[in-house]
């Protein structure tokens, strides 16, 4: 009689994570008497996957009824496959012996590769806000995919970015892989409504890439521009001075009026006007009683935006019978009309 052969017909199989893997194995003879066992890997460190007679293998079921007389099919099904199950599986025939069973013959092995989807890409930006014209870095991470081949692209408002670096880890063989990419983005004043997108394409996604996004509104700080103007006289001895705070983001803003360097009033921005580009405008005014001042008055509008150092703009108010246009921003005098606020 011909010597028993262990036949594993499949050289390799590929299974999606979460599915079941069927590993085929048949023997050509019932002799010698002894059990079949399945292992992952070869050599002394091999891992026992299934022993038909003892042990606990809750994820493994046999394809055919091993108890049937003259059964020669020892195929198994492993449920709920994960990337950790990847490897080469051997169907091994043992011969009964004393004290232990003796390995008689092994199949050629079946390599199981596991297709695992990448996790949803997570995009994170810088910890601190940055202002327009500055370059900021965004990172994108995705984990747990297999095989290793993967494509990552960066976009800003639909336009593909080219300044980025990507690494896939580990470099060698692994059950699953991670991708890490860093893109550099130059901020502009119009970026409050902008989005940075990281797009990951992988064989498991069937042409439907995964995307992670970051809103530049969480990254950008647009500092305000200030304009101080003198409004027409309301009453004979009163002057209305306005401070226009324009095109700033985010909203957090505190304004302080100083008269000759002394704090007159502090207020926190509210009822803001939003511009189309997502920035905000705000206006504050100060009513100055000219008759209370013997000398010229230096009015300063001081703005602290988003916790940054204060910026200010001053206006010199002449206290005279016929005041002329004065000030560092050449605001109109009390008798002249000013431009309407935004």
């Amino acid at each position: 009689e011909e010597e028993l052969q262990v036949i594993q017909p499949d050289k390799s199989i590929s299974v999606a994570a979460g599915e079941s893997a069927t590993l085929h194995c048949t023997v050509t003879s019932l002799i010698p008497v002894g059990p079949i066992q399945w292992f992952r890997g070869a050599g002394p460190g091999r891992e026992l996957i299934y022993n038909q007679k003892e042990g606990h293998f809750p994820r493994v079921t046999t394809v055919s009824d091993l108890t049937k007389r003259n059964n020669m099919d020892f195929s198994i099904r492993i449920s709920n496959i994960t990337p950790a199950d990847a490897g080469t599986y051997y169907c091994v025939k043992f011969r009964k012996g004393s004290p232990d069973h003796v390995e008689f013959k092994s199949g050629a092995g079946t390599e199981l590769s596991v297709r695992a989807k990448p996790s949803a890409p997570v995009v994170s930006g810088p910890a601190a806000r940055a202002t327009p014209q500055h370059t900021v870095s965004f990172t994108c991470e995705s984990h747990g995919f297999s095989p290793r081949d993967i494509t990552l692209k960066w976009f800003k408002n639909g336009n593909e970015l080219s300044d980025f670096q990507t690494n896939v880890d580990p470099a060698g063989d692994s059950v699953s892989y991670s991708i890490h990419s860093t893109a550099k983005v130059v901020l502009t004043r119009e970026d409050v409504h902008s989005q940075v997108i990281c797009e990951v394409a992988h064989v498991t996604l069937q042409g439907d890439p995964l995307r992670g996004t970051a809103n530049l509104s969480e990254t950008i700080r647009v500092p305000p521009t200030l304009e101080v103007t003198q409004q027409p006289v309301r009453a004979e001895n009163q002057v209305n001075v306005t401070c226009q705070v324009r095109k700033f983001y985010p909203q957090r803003l505190q304004l302080t009026w100083l008269e000759n360097g002394n704090v007159s009033r502090t207020e926190t921005a509210s009822t803001l006007t939003e511009n189309k580009d997502g920035t905000y405008n705000w206006m504050s005014w100060l009513l100055v009683n000219v008759s209370a001042h013997r000398d010229d008055v230096k009015l300063t509008c001081q703005v602290e935006h988003d916790g940054q150092p204060a910026v200010s703009k001053s206006h010199d108010l002449k206290v005279s019978a016929h005041p002329k246009e004065q000030g560092s921003n050449t605001a109109p005098g009390p008798a002249l009309a000013s431009a309407a606020p935004l």
Epitope: V33, P44, G45, R46, E47, L48, Q52, K53, E54, G55, H56, L66, T67, K96, P99, D100
Partner: antibody, heavy 113, light 108 residues
Framework: EVQLQQSGAELVKPGASVKLSCTAS????????MHWVKQRTEQGLEWIGR????????KYAPKFQGKATITADTSSNTAYLQLSSLTSEDTAVYYC??????WGQGTLVTVSA | QIVLTQSPAIMSASPGEKVTLTCSAS???????LYWYQQKPGSSPKLWIY???NLASGVPARFSGSGSGTSYSLTISSMEAEDAASYFC?????????FGGGTKLEIK
């Protein structure tokens, strides 16, 4: 559902023999090795041996060679452990188990004059 | 034969405490063949961890197993009252199969 029902407690005299049974339900004992384990009061577990009910092949721990005999009857789906020449050292709970995963409730054997 | 030595023989732990039980083998045991059983007084042993690190059905996730070669351990990340029991390691890598002497784990 896998169940292993062991025979009741035994009080036996020194020098006598006793045969314990372990009847399986929910599976066929022919498909698994059936093991027997000894546990003395407040002590550890000792592997006695096992049987392959399919062909009657047995393995024993050296300590229990000659003391224990494991048999099986596939028609009644039952495994047996026979202990001979009993001494007080054999007073213990004896467990059967299926392939190391499922255990019977145990049988207390007390050897006393 | 492979001798399994468990330590400590007896230990007590407070609720919430991390507990590690060790099992040392006199010669190398393949991790696939190292099992742990839990036993409570008056009950049969229950398979608790199989193939070194896999939790049997119904075992809380606070339990974990690790090791290779001659050194294995069972860890409870945060002790609970219901974990008070005896724990036995077991090898079936080669005949005769053997058990460790057990660790009796008590709650403080």
């Amino acid at each position: 559902e896998v169940q292993l029902q062991q025979s009741g407690a035994e009080l036996v005299k020194p020098g006598a023999s006793v045969k314990l049974s372990c009847t399986a339900s929910g599976f066929n004992i022919k498909d698994y090795y059936m093991h027997w384990v000894k546990q003395r009061t407040e002590q550890g577990l000792e592997w006695i041996g096992r049987i392959d009910p399919e062909d009657g092949e047995t393995k024993y721990a050296p300590k229990f060679q000659g003391k224990a005999t494991i048999t099986a009857d596939t028609s009644s789906n039952t495994a047996y452990l026979q202990l001979s020449s009993l001494t007080s050292e054999d007073t213990a709970v004896y467990y059967c188990d299926r392939g190391l995963a499922y255990w019977g409730q145990g049988t207390l054997v007390t050897v006393s004059a | 034969q492979i001798v399994l030595t468990q330590s400590p023989a007896i230990m007590s732990a407070s609720p919430g405490e991390k507990v590690t039980l060790t099992c040392s083998a006199s010669s190398s045991v393949s991790s696939s063949y190292l099992y742990w059983y839990q036993q409570k007084p008056g009950s049969s042993p229950k398979l608790w961890i199989y193939s070194t690190s896999n939790l049997a059905s119904g075992v809380p996730a606070r339990f974990s197993g690790s090791g290779s070669g001659t050194s294995y351990s069972l860890t409870i990340s945060s002790m609970e009252a219901e974990d008070a029991a005896s724990y036995f390691c077991h090898q079936w890598s080669s005949y005769p199969y053997t058990f460790g002497g057990g660790t009796k784990l008590e709650i403080k």
